[in-house]
């Protein structure tokens, strides 16, 4: 069956050192437990997180994301997943692409992460 992949239409904001959550869903919603679900970073398709065959595939991750990501799957039965990235870095800023693959059918959605410095402030006057 065909579907669309939908992500946030506005940039997601996070502070350096915090965690951030990137949500993504399919429409119409359906059980995605048996699908391949992942996030990568264009333009070089570096794997941020990959879920396949019912489990997370840590070995495929880009080194800079190893140990920093978690796929929240409490709503995967409805086709909704969220990628949590811990200890956000400035280098995380930019584009992320979420994809769902069902057999040979794949769709994806782009989203943008803005990273801000929690200690940045403008002096008065």
């Amino acid at each position: 069956g065909q579907f669309r992949v939908i992500g946030p239409r506005h940039p997601i904001r996070a502070l350096v050192g915090d965690e951030v959550e990137l949500p993504c869903r399919i429409s119409p919603g359906k059980n995605a437990t048996g699908m391949e679900v992942g996030w990568y970073r264009p333009p070089f398709s570096r794997v941020v997180h990959l879920y396949r065959n019912g489990k997370d595939q840590d070995g495929d991750q880009a080194p800079e994301y190893r140990g920093r990501t978690e796929l929240l799957k409490d709503a995967i039965g409805e086709g909704k997943v969220t990628l949590r990235i811990r200890n956000v870095r400035f280098s995380d800023e930019g584009g992320f692409t979420c994809f769902f693959r069902d057999h040979s059918y794949q769709e994806e959605a782009a989203m943008e992460l803005k990273v801000e410095d929690p200690f940045y402030w403008v002096s008065p006057g």
Partner: antibody, heavy 119, light 106 residues
Framework: QVQLVQSGAEVKKPGSSVKVSCKAS????????ISWVRQAPGQGLEWMGG????????NYAQKFQGRVTITADKSTSTAYMELSSLRSEDTAVYYC????????????WGQGTTVTVSS | DIQMTQSPSTLSASVGDRVTITCRAS??????LAWYQQKPGKAPKLLIY???SLESGVPSRFSGSGSGTEFTLTISSLQPDDFATYYC????????FGQGTKVEIK
């Protein structure tokens, strides 16, 4: 199963404030968008504003800007809506509702909180 | 602000009828439209999202169509449980609801 449980009915005097709570259970609270929608007696639905707890900043409908404050406490998975300078026209049922992220359909709703403003 | 106009305001129908409710947006909202059902004293219930996707657990007699500015909710064969008020809602830019359509027994 996601559930949104709201605080009980309130009776308030004109000019006062009311704070309604919405406690979420089942699911990831922090990245979902919690909206507040009100319905005056016999009237339609009106979006007041919303918040994504993990980001902390709220967005408000222009009509309520300056009079409504929406906050969230991630530690207790609870969202709050405070409406100040109450007038009789604010008598309504106030609902919290969840969207999967900002600007999404609202798939789960609280049971509603009746706020009556009367002198 | 995006305005949503629903028609008709009230609709009288009988069990088994095919019922269509229309919603028009003041500007294009792509397919960012939802339909809700509300019964007296109850919270609204999501029926359709993304203009045409059926929410889990909602009977298949409900369907949605349209994109841009014109949308419809269709109930293929009205059941006794379907007498209620229906609202459309855009979520292209914040949120706006239509004024509602009450479906009552003829």
């Amino acid at each position: 199963q996601v559930q949104l449980v709201q605080s009980g009915a309130e009776v308030k005097k004109p000019g006062s404030s009311v704070k309604v709570s919405c406690k979420a259970s089942g699911g990831t609270f922090s990245s979902y968008a919690i909206s507040w929608v009100r319905q005056a007696p016999g009237q339609g639905l009106e979006w007041m504003g919303g918040i994504i707890p993990i980001f902390g900043t709220a967005n408000y409908a222009q009509k309520f800007q300056g009079r409504v404050t929406i906050t969230a406490d991630k530690s207790t998975s609870t969202a709050y809506m405070e409406l100040s300078s109450l007038r009789s026209e604010d008598t309504a049922v106030y609902y919290c509702a969840r969207g999967y992220f900002s600007e999404e359909a609202m798939d789960y709703w609280g049971q509603g909180t009746t706020v009556t403003v009367s002198s | 602000d995006i305005q949503m106009t629903q028609s008709p305001s009230t609709l009288s129908a009988s069990v088994g009828d095919r019922v269509t409710i229309t919603c028009r947006a003041s500007q294009s909202i792509s397919s960012w439209l939802a339909w809700y059902q509300q019964k007296p004293g109850k919270a609204p219930k999501l029926l359709i999202y993304d203009a045409s996707s059926l929410e889990s657990g909602v009977p298949s007699r409900f369907s949605g169509s349209g994109s841009g500015t014109e949308f419809t909710l269709t109930i293929s064969s009205l059941q006794p449980d379907d007498f209620a008020t229906y609202y459309c809602q855009q979520y292209d830019s914040y949120y706006t609801f239509g004024q509602g359509t009450k479906v009552e027994i003829k």
